[in-house]
Interface confidence: low
């Protein structure tokens, strides 16, 4: 009987000799759960794993705690990974987090991050972030010390408002922070004085909605 | 190059319903909220309703005029939108245009629909 | 529902001239109001959107200013191809809702 070959991101899915961009199988060593994630073959030498795509407003990313948890979406268009499989995947080594911005104008930028992890769900998923480089802006437009992250139904943000319920999406809310990639899709001519749209302020400023996003990671040693 | 198609327009009497649809290519389509705006003969411009994205639950505005008669929906699939007309008015006489999201950069040639017994 | 109110109604002008044409809002609209052309059995295009942005392809000579309330767009040398009607539109809250519009006719 031929051995099921398991990968548990993108990058082993590259080296396997898988160089084609789409959709791939992932699963976590020594667990028997699967997730179905979009791996970027292309993009700067390949082996990207998608954690998070927007591109056309077809997902509603106004979603609970558990659904974040465990990811939403279709991996071929909008979707989230899940925050549990990141969280676990980040922790077993060390990664990077490259997130690429488009703009309604056809004007590109994109954020690294040469150390990404997520703790676990217990301290609330909270980012962990160092050595910024890219053209989206010299601050991090994600709050730095990285923030818990929050839901409509789970309010971890340093706001006594709701940062999720009033900026729509859940996210690394500060009070509220600079950013938030999972907030309203607003079309084009629709995307300006939007304080709860598609948010990166150190590229953008605080009222664009961008028109797509995608955020990658890949092992640092790859 | 962008293209918006309207159809269905024709000759209803009053009480009588159409269906009118919008034909989109050119652009991409799922991005963008729809509306249809209205004009009378020799009148001005009327905004009649809105639909938005799959990620808005499709939320629809209608004007009051047209509010519980008039019905917006959009396929995704087929790059459609439509407008179904019940229960028409002499008034509601007038060509239909469709166009994208509000400023409105797209619009279609439009088609008459005419209320009369 | 916010009112637009155009004027005036209608204009004649000659080639060359300057022609401005205002709008005012029954409430404040920000700067959600766009500008538009309409030729007889056309659909109208769009010329200016959020009060003063040029849309794609539109000539420099026109220009659209003010917030708020009053709102202005302005063709500095009018051109033949420029006798049309003009409305002006707000789309900062439902119903969106457009003025009366203003024809531009040959002097």
């Known amino acids: 009987k031929e051995e099921q070959i398991s990968f548990r991101d993108c990058a082993e899915v590259f080296k396997s000799g898988h160089t084609t961009n789409g959709v791939y199988t992932l699963t976590l060593p020594n667990s028997t759960e699967e997730v179905k994630a979009y791996c970027d073959m292309e993009a700067g030498g390949g082996g990207w794993t998608i954690i998070q795509r927007r591109e056309d407003g077809s997902v509603d990313f106004q979603r609970t705690w558990k659904e974040y948890k465990v990811g939403f979406g279709n991996p071929s268009g909008e979707y989230w990974l899940g925050n549990e499989f990141v969280s676990q995947l980040t922790n077993q080594q060390r990664y990077v987090l490259k997130i690429h911005l488009k703009d309604w104008e056809g004007n590109e930028a994109y954020s690294l991050y040469e150390h990404f992890y997520l703790s676990s769900e217990e301290l609330n998923y909270r980012i962990h972030l160092k050595g910024l480089t890219g053209t989206a802006g010299k601050i991090s437009s994600i709050s730095q010390p990285g923030n818990d992250f929050s839901t409509k139904d789970a309010d971890n943000d340093k706001c006594i408002c709701k940062c999720s319920q009033m900026l729509t999406g859940g996210w690394w809310f500060d009070a509220c922070g600079p950013s938030n990639l999972n907030g309203m899709y607003y079309p084009q001519r629709q995307n300006t004085n939007k304080f709860n749209g598609i948010k990166w302020y150190y590229w953008k400023g605080s009222g664009y909605s961008l028109k797509g996003t995608t955020m990658m990671i890949r092992p640092a040693d790859f | 190059e962008v293209q918006l198609v309207e159809s269905g327009g024709g000759l209803v009497k009053p009480g009588g319903s159409l269906r009118l649809s919008c034909a989109a290519s050119?652009?991409?389509?799922?991005?963008?909220?729809m509306n249809w705006v209205r004009q009378a003969p020799g009148k001005g411009l009327e905004w009649v309703a809105e639909i938005r994205l799959k990620s808005n639950n499709y939320a629809t505005h209608y004007a009051e005029s047209v509010k519980g008669r008039f019905t917006i929906s959009r396929d995704v699939s087929k790059n459609t939108v439509y407008l179904q007309m019940n229960s028409l008015k002499t008034e509601d006489t007038a060509v239909y245009y469709c166009?994208?999201?509000?400023?409105?950069?797209?619009w279609g040639q439009g088609t008459l629909v005419t209320v009369s017994s | 529902d916010i009112q637009m109110t155009q004027s005036p109604s209608s204009l004649s002008a000659s080639v060359g001239d300057r022609v401005t044409i205002t709008c005012k809002a029954s409430?404040?609209?920000?700067?959600?109001v766009a500008w538009y052309q309409q030729k007889p059995g056309k659909a109208p295009k769009l010329l200016i959107y959020?009060?003063?942005t040029r849309h794609t392809g539109v000539p420099s000579r026109f220009s659209g200013s003010g917030s708020g309330t009053d709102f202005t767009l302005t063709i500095s040398s009018l051109q033949p191809e420029d006798f049309a009607t003009y409305y002006c539109?707000?789309?900062?809250?439902?119903?969106?809702?457009f003025g009366g519009g203003t024809k531009v006719e040959i002097k």
């Open positions: 539109q707000q789309y900062s809250s439902y119903p969106l809702t």
């Open positions: 959020w009060a003063s």
């Open positions: 409430q404040d609209v920000g700067t959600d």
């Open positions: 050119g652009f991409t389509f799922s991005n963008y909220w």
């Open positions: 166009t994208d999201t509000a400023p409105f950069a797209y």
